[in-house]
Interface confidence: low
C-alpha cells in the first residue's frame, strides 16, 4: 500500500476549507492534535479535526444527502405534479364543454325547455365535477335527479303545452311517474352505467397521481438518522482531518454506505413498481365507457335521444299520466 | 340525433367523426405519462447508485478513500475496511423504515389494490340491450365505435373525439423540467432523471 502523503503540518488547508462551512476559525486546530475526543473520524495519528468540526461535518453531510435526494426526485416530481395539474384541469374542461354541449343541444332542439333545463344541467355537471374531486356524491342519485327534474318540464312544455297554470302542482307526481313508468326507457340506466364507470376511473386516476406526489414528497423530505450522518461524514469528510483534501471515496464503499442510509427508502421500491404497473393497467382500461371524455362529451346526444324517446311515446304516456296525476293531491308518487 | 344545423337535424344523418391519429388526445396524454413513469420504475432501488454517481467518488483516480485510509481503487480494502470499527451497518438496515415511510407504503398498498380493482378486463363493452324494458328503444350496432345514445333513429357514432389539451396552459415536455439539461437515454435499471 502506498504511503499516504504527509499531513498538512499546519492544518492551513483544512482551515481554509472549513471556513467555507463555518465562518470563524476557532474550531480548527493550528497544528495537528491527537483528537482523542473524536467519535466519527477516529484518528490513526495526529488530526486537524476537533469535536465541534466533526459535528458540523455531520450536519453538512446530512444536508448534502437531503439535497442529493431532492435533486434525484426533481424530474419525477415535476412530471407527476404537472400531469396531476394538467389532468385535473383537463377533466374540468371536459365537464365544462360537456355542459356547454348539453346546453347547446337544448337551445337548438328544445328551446321551450330552457332556461329550466340549463339549471338542471348545470347542477348535474357541478355534481360531476365535485365527484371527480372526491366528493361523497352518489352518481345514480345525480342522474335520477337530472331526469326527475327534466320530466315535469318536458311534460308541461313539450307533451302538454296547453296545460293550464293551475295544473302545475302535479310536478311532484310527475317526478314519481317518471321512474314508475320508465318514461325515458332505459336511457337513465344507460347514463348511470356510463357516467358512474367513467367517473370512478377518472377519480381513482387523479387520486393515484396525487398519491404519487405524496410518495415523492415523503421520501424527498426524509431526515436521515444520526448513524447515517456518521457514515456519510466518515466517507465524505474524515479524509480532510488528515489533510487529504483532494481524495474521493471509493465507489464500492459509497454504495455500501448509501445502501445503509437508504435501507428504509428502498423498501418502497416493490410497491412503487406495482403502483406504476397498476396505473398503466388502469390507463389501458380507460376507453369507451371507462373514458369520461368519451362518455361526458356524448351525454348531450344520449339526453337528446332520451327526450326523443319520450316524444315517440307521448300519446301512451299522456294518457297514463293523465290518469295517475289527475288527483295528485291524494296520490303522491315518491 | 342531436346534430345542430337544422337541415342536418331534419335529415337525421348519422355523423361519423373522423378518426384523428396524430393529434393529441387525453388518452394519448395518459399513455405518454405512463411511458414516462415507467422510465422511473426502478427509481427507489436505483437511488443509492444515483447518490453515489452524483457525489464525489473516485472514478479515474488511482487512490480512493475507504473511510479510514487511502487505498488503491481496485483493492478489496476499497469497500471493506472503512466499515470496520465504525458501527454495525447490518444493524442500521435492520431498524426498518421510518414510520413516515411505513405510512406511505401502506397508502401505496391501498391505492395499488384500488387500481387493480378498477382496472377493467379488456374487451368488455357496454350491454346494448336497451329495449328490455320501458316502452321501446333502438339498439346499437356492434361495430368498433362506442355507441353513445340509443335511438336507432340516427345515433351519433363517436370515435376519437377530442384532440385535447389545446386549451391547457401547460407544456409538459420533460425538456422543460427544472434541472433537466442533458438527459442520457435511461437504461432499464437507471433513473432517467440522473445526469452526470
Amino acid at each position: 500500500q502506498p504511503p499516504p502523503p504527509p499531513p498538512d503540518a499546519t492544518c492551513h488547508q483544512v482551515r481554509s476549507f472549513f471556513q467555507r462551512l463555518q465562518p470563524g476559525l476557532k474550531w480548527v486546530p493550528e497544528t495537528p492534535v491527537p483528537g482523542s475526543d473524536l467519535q466519527v473520524c477516529l484518528p490513526k495519528g495526529p488530526t486537524c479535526c476537533s469535536r465541534k468540526m466533526e459535528e458540523k461535518y455531520q450536519l453538512t453531510a446530512r444536508l448534502n444527502m437531503e439535497q442529493l435526494l431532492q435533486s434525484a426526485s426533481m424530474e419525477l416530481k415535476f412530471l407527476i405534479i404537472q400531469n396531476a395539474a394538467v389532468f385535473q384541469e383537463a377533466f374540468e374542461i371536459v365537464v365544462r364543454h360537456a355542459k356547454n354541449y348539453t346546453n347547446a343541444m337544448f337551445k337548438n332542439n328544445y328551446p321551450s325547455l330552457t332556461p329550466q333545463a340549463f339549471e338542471f344541467v348545470g347542477e348535474f355537471f357541478t355534481d360531476v365535477s365535485l365527484y371527480i374531486l372526491g366528493s361523497d356524491i352518489n352518481v345514480d342519485d345525480m342522474v335520477n335527479e337530472l331526469f326527475d327534474s327534466l320530466f315535469p318540464v318536458i311534460y308541461t312544455q313539450l307533451m302538454n303545452p296547453g296545460l293550464p297554470d293551475s295544473a302545475l302542482d302535479i310536478n311532484e307526481c310527475l317526478r314519481g311517474a317518471r321512474r314508475d313508468l320508465k318514461v325515458f326507457g332505459n336511457f337513465p340506466k344507460l347514463i348511470m352505467t356510463q357516467v358512474s364507470k367513467s367517473l370512478q376511473v377518472t377519480r381513482i386516476f387523479l387520486q393515484a397521481l396525487n398519491l404519487g406526489i405524496e410518495v415523492i414528497n415523503t421520501t424527498d423530505h426524509l431526515k436521515f438518522s444520526k448513524d447515517c450522518g456518521r457514515m456519510l461524514t466518515r466517507m465524505w469528510y474524515c479524509s480532510y482531518c488528515q489533510g487529504l483534501m483532494m481524495v474521493k471515496p471509493c465507489g464500492g464503499y459509497c454504495n455500501v454506505v448509501m445502501q445503509g442510509c437508504m435501507a428504509g427508502v428502498v423498501e418502497i421500491d416493490k410497491y412503487w413498481r406495482e403502483y406504476i404497473l397498476s396505473l398503466e393497467e388502469l390507463v389501458n382500461g380507460m376507453y369507451r365507457i371507462y373514458d369520461m371524455e368519451n362518455v361526458l362529451l356524448g351525454l348531450f346526444s344520449t339526453i337528446h335521444d332520451s327526450i326523443q324517446y319520450v316524444q315517440k311515446n307521448a300519446g301512451k304516456l299522456t294518457t297514463t299520466i293523465g290518469k295517475l296525476c289527475a288527483h295528485s293531491q291524494q296520490r303522491q308518487y315518491r | 340525433s342531436a346534430y345542430y344545423p337544422e337541415d342536418l337535424f331534419i335529415d337525421k344523418k348519422v355523423l361519423k367523426v373522423a378518426h384523428v391519429e396524430h393529434e393529441e388526445t387525453l388518452s394519448s396524454r395518459r399513455r405518454e405519462l405512463i411511458q414516462k413513469l415507467k422510465s422511473f420504475i426502478s427509481f427507489y432501488s436505483a437511488l443509492p447508485g444515483y447518490i453515489c454517481s452524483h457525489s464525489p467518488v473516485a472514478e479515474n483516480d488511482t487512490l480512493c478513500w475507504n473511510g479510514q485510509e487511502l487505498v488503491e481503487r481496485y483493492s478489496q480494502k476499497a469497500a471493506r475496511n472503512g466499515m470496520k470499527n465504525q458501527f454495525n451497518l447490518h444493524e442500521l438496515k435492520m431498524k426498518g423504515p421510518e414510520p413516515v415511510v411505513s405510512q406511505i407504503i401502506d397508502k401505496l398498498k391501498h391505492i395499488n389494490q384500488l387500481l387493480r380493482t378498477m382496472s377493467m378486463p379488456k374487451g368488455r363493452v357496454l350491454d346494448k340491450n336497451l329495449d328490455e324494458e320501458g316502452f321501446e328503444s333502438g339498439d346499437c350496432g356492434d361495430d368498433e365505435d362506442e355507441c353513445i345514445g340509443g335511438s336507432g333513429d340516427g345515433m351519433i357514432k363517436v370515435k376519437n373525439q377530442l384532440r385535447f389539451l389545446a386549451e391547457l396552459a401547460y407544456d409538459l415536455d420533460v425538456d422543460d423540467a427544472p434541472g433537466n439539461s442533458q438527459q442520457a437515454t435511461p437504461k432499464d435499471n437507471e433513473i432517467s432523471t440522473f445526469h452526470n
Epitope: N100, N103, K107 | Y4, P5, L8, L15, A18, V20
Partner: antibody, heavy 126, light 106 residues
C-alpha cells in the same frame, strides 16, 4: 408551415356571381372545420359561413343564407365559397380561417380561428 | 342575433397597461381575441378566454366573468398598435365578432 391562400376575388356587378377558393397546406385539412370571414372597407370582422371537417355540416350567417354556398374538397385541400346574387354590401376582403376546434366533429366553431389567409378582395359595383 | 360590444378605441403610453372589454357574451361560450395589424390578416391572440397560442407574448392575457370578457395588455409597445376583436358563438354555435377596438400607442 401551416398556410391558407385565398383566390378568386375581383370586381363583379350586382346580381353577379364569384367563386372564392382557399388552398390549405401544412395540416391535415379534413380534420378541421373551416370558416369564411369578411371585412368590409373600414369595418369590423363578420363571420360569413362555416363547414365541418367532413363537409357534411354547413352553416351560414343570416345575411348570406340562400345566396352563398360553402363547400370543400378534402382530396385537394381546398375550401370554396360560391357567391351568387351579389350585392354592394358584400364588398369586402374575404378571409378563410381554420377552426381551432379540438376535432370534435359534431361540435364546431367553438375554439376560435387559429390560422387565417391573407384575404382576397371582392368588389360588387356597377 | 347575439351582439358583442367593444369600445371603439383605447389608448395608452408605452409601458402602460390597457384593457379592452367585450360584453354581451350571454351564450356561455368562451371568448377569443384577435389582433389585426394595419393591412394584415387577423391573428388569434387569446383562445378559450385566457390561453395564449405559442408565440404570443405573455404581456397579453384574457379574463372572463359572466357575460363580459376582457383583454389586458401590459408593458404596452409601439408594435401593439392594431385593431383588436373579441369573438364568441351564438346559441346556434355560429361565430360572432365584436365591433373591434382600435388601440393607439401614444
Amino acid at each position: 408551415e401551416v398556410q391558407l391562400v385565398e383566390s378568386g376575388g375581383g370586381l363583379v356587378q350586382p346580381g353577379g356571381s364569384l367563386r372564392l377558393s382557399c388552398a390549405a397546406s401544412g395540416f391535415t385539412f379534413g380534420n378541421y372545420a373551416m370558416s369564411w370571414v369578411r371585412q368590409a372597407p373600414g369595418k369590423g370582422l363578420e363571420w360569413v359561413s362555416g363547414v365541418s371537417g367532413s363537409g357534411d355540416g354547413t352553416y351560414y350567417a343570416d345575411s348570406v343564407k340562400g345566396r352563398f354556398t360553402i363547400s370543400r374538397d378534402n382530396s385537394k385541400n381546398t375550401l370554396y365559397l360560391q357567391m351568387n346574387s351579389l350585392r354592394a354590401e358584400d364588398t369586402a376582403v374575404y378571409y378563410c380561417a381554420k377552426e381551432y376546434d379540438f376535432g370534435l366533429g359534431w361540435m364546431h366553431y367553438y375554439y376560435g380561428m387559429d390560422v387565417w389567409g391573407q384575404g382576397t378582395t371582392v368588389t360588387v359595383s356597377s | 342575433q347575439s351582439v358583442l360590444t367593444q369600445p371603439p378605441s383605447v389608448s395608452g403610453a408605452p409601458g402602460q397597461r390597457v384593457t379592452i372589454s367585450c360584453t354581451g357574451s350571454s351564450s356561455g361560450y368562451d371568448v377569443h381575441w384577435y389582433q389585426q395589424l394595419p393591412g394584415r390578416a387577423p391573428k388569434l391572440l387569446i383562445y378559450g378566454s385566457n390561453n395564449r397560442p405559442s408565440g404570443v407574448p405573455d404581456r397579453f392575457s384574457g379574463s372572463n366573468s359572466g357575460t363580459s370578457a376582457s383583454l389586458a395588455i401590459t408593458g404596452l409597445q409601439a408594435e401593439d398598435e392594431a385593431d383588436y376583436y373579441c369573438q364568441s358563438y351564438d346559441s346556434s354555435l355560429n361565430a360572432i365578432f365584436g365591433g373591434g377596438t382600435k388601440l393607439t400607442v401614444l
